[in-house]
């Protein structure tokens, strides 16, 4: 297990409507290991996400960070947001630590829609 | 180094169309997770946004101009435009087309700017 | 919408000396959803700050922003001749708004 996860995208855009319900699963963020088995298995967390609207959490079968709506949102109070996410190997022996000191991060810009005046395509 | 520039008449009659378009180059305007914004600033004022684009096409308006503003996008031409109907005086401004950033919504990259006078 | 207030509207300095430029929010947004603009005569603004504390490329590090709430304040530590310009806040929570302003003069 000497390579640590690392995100296919340093950048990331999902949308959640104002109408969403709490639990939603707002889209999917993946990132890639080139260890094999249980080696390339990891985990998913929130880094940073100053209005604690969001969570992330792992599919263990696919390796997908899955980006889950923690708190509704309200068009008019906050219609933009922005989450840092970190991705870090589930089994690491304590001797290959030293690979996986660094997680790998990626930004995931979030707009919620009007549910009022859907967006214009 | 992503630059912008933009491109279009200088000068627009009242009740007219203001029609401006940004060429991207330096980076594709269809690179996941950015969003490419218009924003104009009066003579001697401050700035305002007017409105944003994905590459996908989906966009999102300035609700003070929503009635007046389409934003369009064309991959192909590395492209994004800006059409501002029945225009007034008060329209008359510096055009900048920007881009946001990689770790928020803050704009990262700006074009320099054309200036759009309305006027008969 | 959320309205930005900057103060001074003016401010008259000398090289040297530091500046301290006021961003005051209408109601409370998150301290990430804040950034600060130079524009100079006839330029772009450029991004100095967002976040609200970090430092975008290129810019030195006597640029700094702090605050949280609704205020916010930019300073710049020890004026270069290069500074004397207008600065700007931006608020992007909540669609995307701009303060009208702080002119940095040379006294």
């Known amino acids: 297990n000497d390579n640590k996860p690392i995100f296919k995208e340093s950048l990331y855009r999902l949308t959640v409507s104002e109408s969403a319900p709490t639990g939603t699963s707002i889209g999917t963020i993946m990132a890639y290991d080139n260890d094999i088995g249980e080696n390339a298995e990891m985990d998913y967390s929130i880094e940073e996400d100053d209005s604690q609207t969001f969570d992330i959490i792992t599919n263990h079968e696919t390796q997908e960070g899955i980006v889950i709506l923690k708190k509704k949102v309200d068009f008019e109070h906050q219609n933009h947001y922005g989450i840092r996410a970190k991705v870090k190997n589930h089994h690491v022996p304590e001797q290959l630590m030293k690979y996986h000191t660094e997680a790998s991060t990626t930004f995931i810009k979030i707009q919620v829609e009007d549910v009022d005046e859907p967006p214009v395509f | 180094q992503v630059q912008l520039q933009e491109s279009g008449p200088g000068l627009v009659k009242p009740s007219e169309t203001l029609s401006l378009t940004c060429t991207v180059s330096g980076g594709s305007i269809s690179s996941s997770g950015y969003y490419w914004s218009w924003i104009r600033q009066p003579p001697g004022k401050g700035l305002e946004w007017i409105g944003y684009?994905?590459?996908?096409?989906?966009?999102y308006y300035n609700p003070s101009l929503k009635s007046r503003v389409t934003i369009s996008v064309d991959t192909s031409k590395n492209q994004f435009s800006l059409k501002l109907s029945s225009v007034t005086a008060a329209d008359t401004a510096v055009y900048y087309c920007a881009r946001d950033g990689s770790s928020g919504w803050y704009f990262q990259y700006w074009g320099q700017g054309t200036l759009v006078t309305v006027s008969s | 919408e959320i309205v930005l207030t900057q103060s001074p509207g003016t401010l008259s300095l000398s090289p040297g000396e530091r500046a301290t430029l006021s961003c005051r929010a209408s109601?409370?947004?998150?301290?990430?959803?804040l950034a600060w603009y130079q524009q100079k005569p006839g330029q772009a603004p450029r991004l100095l700050i967002y976040?609200?504390?970090s430092r975008a490329t290129g810019i030195p590090d006597r640029f700094s922003g702090s605050g949280s709430g609704t205020d916010f304040t930019l300073t710049i530590s020890r004026l270069e001749p290069e500074d004397f310009a207008v600065y700007y806040c931006q608020q992007y929570g909540s669609s995307f708004t701009f303060g009208p302003g702080t002119k940095v003069d040379i006294k």
């Open positions: 976040g609200p504390s």
């Open positions: 684009i994905y590459y996908t096409g989906s966009a």
């Open positions: 109601r409370q947004i998150s301290s990430s959803y």
